[in-house]
């Protein structure tokens, strides 16, 4: 069964800047990747970026840079300032769509030890 992994990291240089990395562990070729925050797309989440292997990348603030890392993994950097910037307990979700197999999604947030209040 295909799986999706999600990794959330806070940048050491900018404590309110996040990097989200997601990957698809499966045999299908990816048609679309959707990254959202605040929950999955279908459950109140807000889309941050949509990545299509042929037709390019769309992103919305506070997303700063979305890109393909491999054919089955992506990364997204979020801006760290402004009213819409994420906080430490924000949930980020990635949904990988593969045709004709279907879609798989997973969510993640910062590990507790990444809390900026705990860092030196």
């Amino acid at each position: 069964t295909p799986e999706v992994w999600v990794q959330v990291r806070m940048e050491a240089t900018e404590l309110s800047s996040f990097t989200i990395r997601c990957g698809f562990l499966g045999s299908g070729s990816i048609s679309l990747v959707t990254v959202s925050w605040g929950g999955p797309n279908g459950a109140g989440g807000t889309t941050l970026a949509v990545l299509h292997p042929e037709r390019g990348i769309r992103q919305w603030a506070p997303a700063r840079q979305a890109r393909w890392e491999t054919q089955s993994s992506i990364s997204l950097i979020l801006e760290g300032s402004g009213a819409s910037s994420p906080c430490a307990n924000t949930t980020f979700c990635c949904k990988f769509a593969s045709f004709p197999e279907g879609s798989w999604e997973a969510c993640g947030s910062l590990p507790p030890s990444s809390d900026p209040g705990l860092s030196a």
Partner: antibody
Framework: EVQLVESGGGLVQPGGSLRLSCAAS????????MSWVRQAPGKGLELVSA????????YYLDTVKGRFTISRDNAKNSLYLQMNSLRAEDTAVYYC?????????????WGQGTLVTVSS | DIQMTQSPSSLSASVGDRVTITCKAS??????VAWYQQKPGKAPKLLIY???NRFTGVPSRFSGSGSGTDFTLTISSLQPEDFATYFC?????????FGQGTKLEIK
Amino acid sequence: EVQLVESGGGLVQPGGSLRLSCAASGFTFSSYHMSWVRQAPGKGLELVSAINSNVISTYYLDTVKGRFTISRDNAKNSLYLQMNSLRAEDTAVYYCARHEDYYGFAMDYWGQGTLVTVSS
Amino acid sequence: DIQMTQSPSSLSASVGDRVTITCKASQSVSNDVAWYQQKPGKAPKLLIYYVSNRFTGVPSRFSGSGSGTDFTLTISSLQPEDFATYFCQQAYRSPWTFGQGTKLEIK
């Protein structure tokens, strides 16, 4: 203007064969996943077969596996369905449809359909 | 396979009525739900994708809602051209499956 035009339907005896064709125009055919959907008289819609844009993956309804073969020729902007060992229960209108990645694989354009009648 | 159970199977209504058609999935289908309209002898037409997004040219009286397993198509004020059969469909997991259809008839 997006257009899908099916052909190749007709009356065939049980055990016989037909080859359906779908001619596509008005869009970059090679970038889209395609499907064949059928509708028996007075019944609902049923996905028969699907093929992704790069011809890596296909799907077949269980009852047509081993009898039907989906293929596409991106150079000719055409989709095909080779139907062998036809049965009475294959009688239906067959539609070709285009899937839009950005719409969650919804079928955004359909052909007018071609009627396949399997009867002795 | 994911089952899509649509209700009601038929519905009589008058021009100007507000109509709601529901679709229940046998398991969560995220937001990968579409609605189609089909008139006799014609191919289906896409109305709604991703649960609530209207396809190009679809009038604003058509709206979709729901999440997870429960979805709704609403026509806010029926027009004569809306009498047709409506199908929901999930595209979350292969095979894509359709509801059995709701036939909307003139009362």
